[in-house]
Interface confidence: low
């Protein structure tokens, strides 16, 4: 049985819109259906309709189709807003250009190339012919419009009203000629809906034949209308998924506009001496990375191969070997001429407006009074007086207003990690400033004079869902997926937040990642009922040198018998030596027949000095690290466990005390593991959770 083609791709959708007929003579046909796809199939095939269907409306509330022999461009019709309606118009009737030979052209051009008016198809004057509308059903031989019913070489044509000229082609442009783009088409919002090889594009709001992550509702600013070619991911030019099950995606043939000017909205502020924001408009001539290694030329493939070439990124000024930011990275960067270092940031380029008064701080910087007013990611600080309400929300004392002048970096909340400021960016409400501690400063950043030893556990007991502990109490364990494969562990510390390691993100493209929760098996086998799959909406990098990342989920996890959060320790707390702890992960287990099940290894806390001795004095631990040794030789964290937690219990309460990060080897016998000490960063974590906006469930 032949598979019925899905024809909804042939329609232009206008959401929340219907058509009202002013002319009572116009016909309409209605019927109850389940989906807009069913309406489209019937409209395209004209099955059971007493007219040629040019458009339809799908009434979502009543689950009803309204088929029309007219569209929004017809006379006697007007558009009207309606929440429950979606209008779909057959593109062939509203398109003013042709695809290929123009066999599907159904527009209203009725003049030939040399300007002669066309003869109506139903008329035999002045030219007798056999192209009768009744003989060419579906070819729309209406009025005297140019058509190409047999798909002949020259494109749409007609018999002419001049007795001397029997027929002539019409001058209707190719859609690929009409459509044009600037740069690499990131701002292209045209109506090209087929690829360079002529394949029809798949609708962005459909998942067949190709499943994908570019959902219109997830990326409202990317222009994912109908099935038009777009460039949402910084490719050389617009592309689309295709309706051919064997061709996942293809580029579209859209030419560059003659006056290749960018829209004002697309132009980053150009600078040559310093960086504004993320430096996308930097056009200076710095050509080494931060440590002096020279940059590789953008038009060269040696020593590093890449596709960031001047041809592929036309408006990004990839000249010579100058530092640039063509892909929305944190700051300008380049490929390096060192074969062992692929890319590097040019962080030596100063930020614009950055004045270097006092460029280091002592202790935690609460007395810093310099005039730096930019965050580490280059965002300009916003005025303190505009943010006092937010500041009061997370500190419980009156800040010293005399210190909070202008928009300078300050530390009014006693943050352990130095001066910071609010930004004007709603996605990044605040961030640290790029100031270092003064050289030789030994002031401890954690000051606990009143309580020399703080307990890590809060007073509350271990949380139990519905009176039953979650399945083996590991509901907080997260599998971070990279291109559909497990890459790292993580801990769910709040419905919308996962604590993990910064090395777990080889690509900056968040579309490459997913978080799986509620699973026991790394492949999710047998976990279908309890598994939650969530997209990642933001990465918040921890304080400098922390190796931590807080990963924001696109929507909150639903806490149930299989998914739960794990508690954080008190800030600056100390856990007694020999406390029994566990590390969890789906990483390499050393077993030949690895079954993909979550593994646990039992460790015990070891003091930093003793830990250093076990590492033969080669490692000095600081206040941001915690050490735990294996009870059994050779058990402990390994690849694939990175980002996962070191979980300890105190006063019957389980907490994430450490995070597994790379660089310390895989469970080396007699070498205890060194973890990032979460207690040292607990205030930062709480501050992020409190101040960053998360989607509501």
């Amino acid at each position: 049985q032949r598979k019925r083609r899905n024809t909804i791709h042939e329609f232009k959708k206008s959401a929340k819109t219907t058509l009202i007929k002013i002319d009572p003579a116009l016909k309409i046909k209605t019927k109850k259906v389940n989906t807009a796809d069913q309406c489209a199939n019937r409209c395209t095939r004209n099955k059971g309709l007493p007219f040629t269907c040019k458009a339809f409306v799908f009434d979502k509330a009543r689950k009803q189709c309204l088929w029309f022999p007219f569209n929004s461009m017809s006379s006697g019709v007007k558009k009207e807003f309606g929440h429950e309606f979606d209008l779909y118009e057959n593109k062939d009737y509203i398109r003013n250009c042709i695809i290929g030979k123009g066999r599907s052209y159904k527009g209203t051009v009725s003049i030939t190339k040399s300007g002669i008016k066309c003869q109506p198809w139903s008329s035999m004057i002045p030219h007798e012919h056999s192209f009768l509308p009744s003989s060419y059903r579906g070819k729309d031989l209406q009025e005297n419009y140019c058509r190409n019913p047999r798909g002949e070489e020259g494109g749409p044509w007609c018999f002419t009203s001049n007795p001397e000229v029997r027929y002539e082609v019409c001058d209707i442009p190719q859609c690929s000629e009409v459509e044009c783009m600037t740069c690499n088409g990131e701002s292209y919002r045209g109506l090209m809906d087929h690829t360079e090889s002529g394949k029809i594009c798949q609708r962005w709001d459909h998942q067949t034949p190709h499943r994908h992550k570019f959902l219109p509702e997830r990326y409202p600013d990317k222009g994912f209308d109908d099935n038009y070619c777009r460039n949402p991911d910084g490719q050389p030019r617009p592309w689309c998924y295709t309706l051919d099950p064997h061709t996942r995606w293809e580029y579209c043939a859209i030419k560059t506009c003659a006056d290749n000017t960018m829209n004002d909205t697309d132009v980053p502020l150009e600078t040559t001496e310093c960086i504004q924001g993320q430096g996308e408009g930097y056009r200076g001539t710095v050509n080494t990375i931060w440590n002096g290694i020279p940059c590789q030329r953008w038009d060269s493939q040696y020593p590093h191969e890449h596709d960031m070439t001047p041809e592929n990124f036309k408006c990004k000024d990839l000249r010579e070997n100058y530092c640039r930011n063509p892909d929305g990275s944190e700051s300008p960067w380049c490929f390096t001429t060192d074969p062992n270092i692929r890319v590097g940031y040019c962080s030596q380029i100063p930020n614009c407006d950055m004045s270097h008064g006092q460029d280091c701080y002592r202790g935690n910087g609460k007395n810093y009074m310099g005039n730096l007013s930019q965050t580490r990611s280059g965002l300009t600080c916003s005025m303190w007086d505009k943010n006092m309400e937010d500041l009061h929300r997370h500190i419980f004392w009156e800040p010293d207003a005399s210190k909070l002048n202008e928009n300078y970096c300050r530390n009014p909340d006693d943050d352990a990690h130095g001066p910071w400021c609010y930004t004007g960016n709603p996605l990044i409400p605040w961030d640290y400033c790029p100031i270092s501690r003064c050289e030789g400063d030994t002031t401890p950043t954690i000051v606990n004079l009143d309580h020399p030893v703080i307990s890590c556990a809060k007073t509350k007991q271990l949380r139990v869902v519905n009176g039953i502990p979650t399945r083996t109490n590991i509901g907080w364990m997260v599998s971070l997926r990279y291109r559909n494969k497990h890459i790292c562990g993580g801990s769910l510390i709040k419905e919308s937040w996962v604590l993990t390691a910064r090395q777990c993100f080889p690509s900056r493209d968040l579309k490459d990642y997913e978080a799986w929760l509620g699973i026991h098996d790394v492949h999710g086998r047998g976990d279908e009922k309890c598994k939650q799959v969530l997209n990642v909406s933001q990465l918040v990098y921890g304080p400098e040198g922390s190796d931590l990342v807080l990963m924001k989920l696109a929507r909150p996890a639903v806490l149930d018998d299989f998914v739960s959060t794990i508690d954080l320790p008190n800030y600056g707390c100390t856990i007694p030596e020999k406390t029994s702890c566990s590390v969890y992960g789906w990483g390499y287990t050393g077993l030949i027949n690895y079954d993909g099940l979550l593994r646990v290894a039992h460790l015990y806390i070891m003091g930093n000095e003793k830990c250093s001795q076990h590492h033969r004095g080669k490692v000095t631990l600081n206040e941001s690290e915690i050490c735990a040794g294996a009870e059994k030789i050779g058990s402990g964290p390994c690849e694939g466990d990175y980002g996962g937690p070191l979980v300890c219990e105190q006063h019957k309460m389980r907490m994430v005390l450490g995070v597994i990060v790379p660089g310390r080897g895989c469970a080396i016998p007699n070498r205890p593991g060194i973890f990032v000490r979460v207690a040292y960063y607990a205030k930062w974590i709480h501050k992020i959770i409190l101040t960053y906006k998360v989607p509501q469930s």
């Epitope: 996942r248 493939q301 191969e305 062992n340 090395q503 390994c638």
Partner: antibody, heavy 115, light 114 residues
């Protein structure tokens, strides 16, 4: 250098592990790929293990092979070989940590699957 | 999956002559293509990467060209030692390719030197 070992004559269904031993460079800066070549046939890519320990496989190899690593070796496990798996197996150093060309190959190790 | 089609499967040429081998990718792989030489009973040897960059120690008689989907390996001033099978290899990874990964080699071209 890279060198493969573990190739031998095995019966169909008998699990087999091939090992690639590396020296002179670190697996924390280079990925390793496995490639095979059946007698009188072309090169066939099996899979890769990246620096961070994540693996990718050719679609036909998914489930038929497993790649894992230690600090100096990379293993290719064939849990249930069939006669079609008779081939010379090469391991190759990938130019850097991700997708790239293979700039160093081992001499290969021959696996014969026969009853 | 990206498919690499190599032509011809076999070619014969005289010493001192020139041989051209073509490799076509089923989608744009930019210049992310390498060529290898393999002699009977030996391991493959990297000749060219980035479509046209000569690997160290490879004579300049070997020349790679092309970008996008069409690539060519040209061997001029043929020597007897050039008798071997030549393979192209694609190493482009697109996040829009399906999550299945593909075989990265072309089918091979046997060069016979008379």
């Amino acid at each position: 250098s890279v060198e493969e070992s573990g190739g031998r004559l095995v019966m169909p269904g008998t699990p087999l592990t091939l090992t690639c031993t590396v020296s002179g460079f670190s697996l924390s800066s280079n990925a390793i790929s496995w490639v095979r070549q059946a007698p009188e046939k072309g090169l066939e890519w099996i899979g890769v293990i990246y620096v961070i320990g994540v693996t990718d496989y050719a679609s036909w190899a998914q489930g038929r092979f497993t790649i894992s690593k230690t600090s100096t070796t990379v293993d290719l496990k064939i849990p249930s070989p069939t006669t079609e798996d008779t081939a010379t197996y090469f391991c190759a150093r990938v130019y850097d940590s991700g997708w790239n060309h293979f700039n160093l190959w081992g001499p290969g190790t021959l696996v014969t699957v026969s009853s | 999956d990206i498919v690499m089609t190599q032509t011809p499967s076999s070619v014969e040429a005289a010493v001192g002559g020139t041989v051209t081998i073509k490799c076509q990718a089923s989608e744009n792989i930019y210049r992310l293509l390498a060529w290898y030489q393999q002699k009977p009973g030996q391991r493959p040897k990297l000749l060219i990467y980035s479509a046209s960059t000569l690997a160290s120690g490879v004579p300049s008689r070997f020349k790679g060209s092309g970008s996008g989907t069409q690539f060519t390996l040209t061997i001029s001033d043929l020597e007897c030692a050039d008798a071997a099978t030549y393979y192209c290899q694609n190493y482009y990874y697109s996040s829009r390719s399906s999550y299945d990964t593909y075989n990265v080699f072309g089918g091979g071209t046997e060069v016979v030197v008379k």
